[in-house]
């Protein structure tokens, strides 16, 4: 096990997850850690505890390894970091990778007020409701601006979008969370259509896929207690 020293002089590795940092309960996920070609061992930590290691074989590329989580559950959702060793030295920690498990317990309802098809500049609010009491709701937009909003609420949360622009058009889903890394099933998708303006923008996104494996997100919130943390949602974190 890695020993903390003041001489962690090797550059920090890059960590990312495939196919996504959002994983349906019971599905598998790969966590990649990329360090150096000279690395003799990689270690993966979960919530600060030693989780797994790999000693790459010389016949393979040694600058990165894949850690396989065969069945994602609420017990494997959370913050992952990795390190690598080269010679006697250990690297600094990678940036945190935050894995979320979805598909737990219940399915929320998502609807939009006043209606799914609105004119440019109209005020729009999304509502997410979950029968099971929860602490936080997340609203996700597929593709588009690739960001998440979250709101605290017991069984319902509202997401005021303000006067909509063409950038708001697209397909949305919401989740209820039981903690930051354990989320409900996704709601049914709601597609927001925007009409009016210079061009006819009422068309829905051309990509019909709704699989979470194809979604990429950044965390974006206006809650005072939470700060923007792009490392949470980027598949690759290396800043």
């Amino acid at each position: 096990q890695r020993i903390n020293t003041e001489k962690e002089t090797l550059p920090k590795p890059i960590i990312w997850a495939k196919p996504s940092i959002m994983v349906t309960n019971g599905n598998s996920v790969n966590i990649w850690c990329q360090g150096a070609q000279s690395a003799s061992e990689y270690q993966l930590y979960f919530e600060g505890s030693f989780f797994a290691l790999e000693r790459p074989k010389p016949s393979r590329s040694m600058n990165k390894v894949r850690f396989f989580i065969s069945q994602m559950t609420s017990h494997t959702a959370g913050i992952y970091t990795c390190f690598y060793q080269s010679g006697e030295l250990w690297s600094k920690s990678s940036n945190p990778l935050k894995l979320v498990v979805t598909g737990l317990y219940d399915t929320p309802n998502l609807w939009v007020y006043p209606r799914p098809e609105v004119t440019l500049g109209e005020n729009v609010t999304f509502f997410c409701q979950l029968k099971t009491a929860t602490s936080k709701f997340f609203l996700l937009k597929e593709r588009g601006s690739n960001h998440i909003q979250n709101k605290y609420g017991n069984i319902q949360a509202e997401f005021p979008m303000g006067p909509v622009t063409r950038a708001h058009r697209g397909t949305y889903r919401c989740f209820g969370s039981y903690n930051d890394y354990a989320w409900s099933f996704p709601s049914e998708p709601v597609t927001l259509l925007i009409t009016g303006g210079v061009e006819n923008s009422s068309l829905a996104p051309t990509d019909p896929t709704s699989s979470l494996d194809y979604w990429e997100f950044d965390l974006s919130t206006n809650e005072s207690g939470l700060q923007k943390d792009s490392a949470f949602w980027d598949h690759t974190t290396q800043n």
Epitope: N30, F46, S49, F50, F51, A52, L53, E54, R55, P56, K57, V65, R66, F67, F68, I69, S70, Q71, T73, H75, T76
Partner: nanobody, 126 residues
Framework: EVQLVESGGGEVQPGGSLRLSCAAS????????MGWFRQAPGKEREFVAA???????YYADSVKGRFTISRDNAKNTVYLQMSSLRAEDTAVYYC????????????????????WGQGTLVTVKP
């Protein structure tokens, strides 16, 4: 579905040896990473040793040099050879598997394991 059955536990004197076996059902054993954990009375379950599907091993500091983990893919069995046993090794020993896995992954954290045996009791006393 994978089933794991441990055997080989028993009572032994300090300094003695035991070999635990864990037999796995199904054809997935060769693609599984395996591990041994133990739980002493009134304590939390702790990691003992693990082996990747390709045979790489890792040990808890408390058993390093005394315990050896190995596997026989032809027999779908993983072993834990325990020697120089001490009173503090007294515990229920559990075999666990990660199925499937990849490459040389060695899993140390119990949350990584998706299949568990029922355990076998090892008692070390004079």
């Amino acid at each position: 579905e994978v089933q794991l059955v441990e055997s080989g536990g028993g009572e032994v004197q300090p300094g003695g040896s035991l070999r635990l076996s864990c037999a796995a059902s199904g054809r997935t054993f060769a693609s599984a990473a395996m591990g041994w954990f133990r739980q002493a009375p009134g304590k939390e379950r702790e990691f003992v040793a693990a082996i990747s599907r390709s045979g790489d091993t890792y040990y808890a500091d408390s058993v390093k040099g005394r315990f050896t983990i190995s596997r026989d893919n032809a027999k779908n069995t993983v072993y834990l050879q325990m020697s120089s046993l001490r009173a503090e090794d007294t515990a229920v020993y559990y075999c666990a598997a990660v199925v499937p896995t990849y490459g040389n992954n060695i899993y140390v954290h119990s949350a990584a394991y998706n299949y568990w045996g029922q355990g076998t009791l090892v008692t070390v006393k004079p």
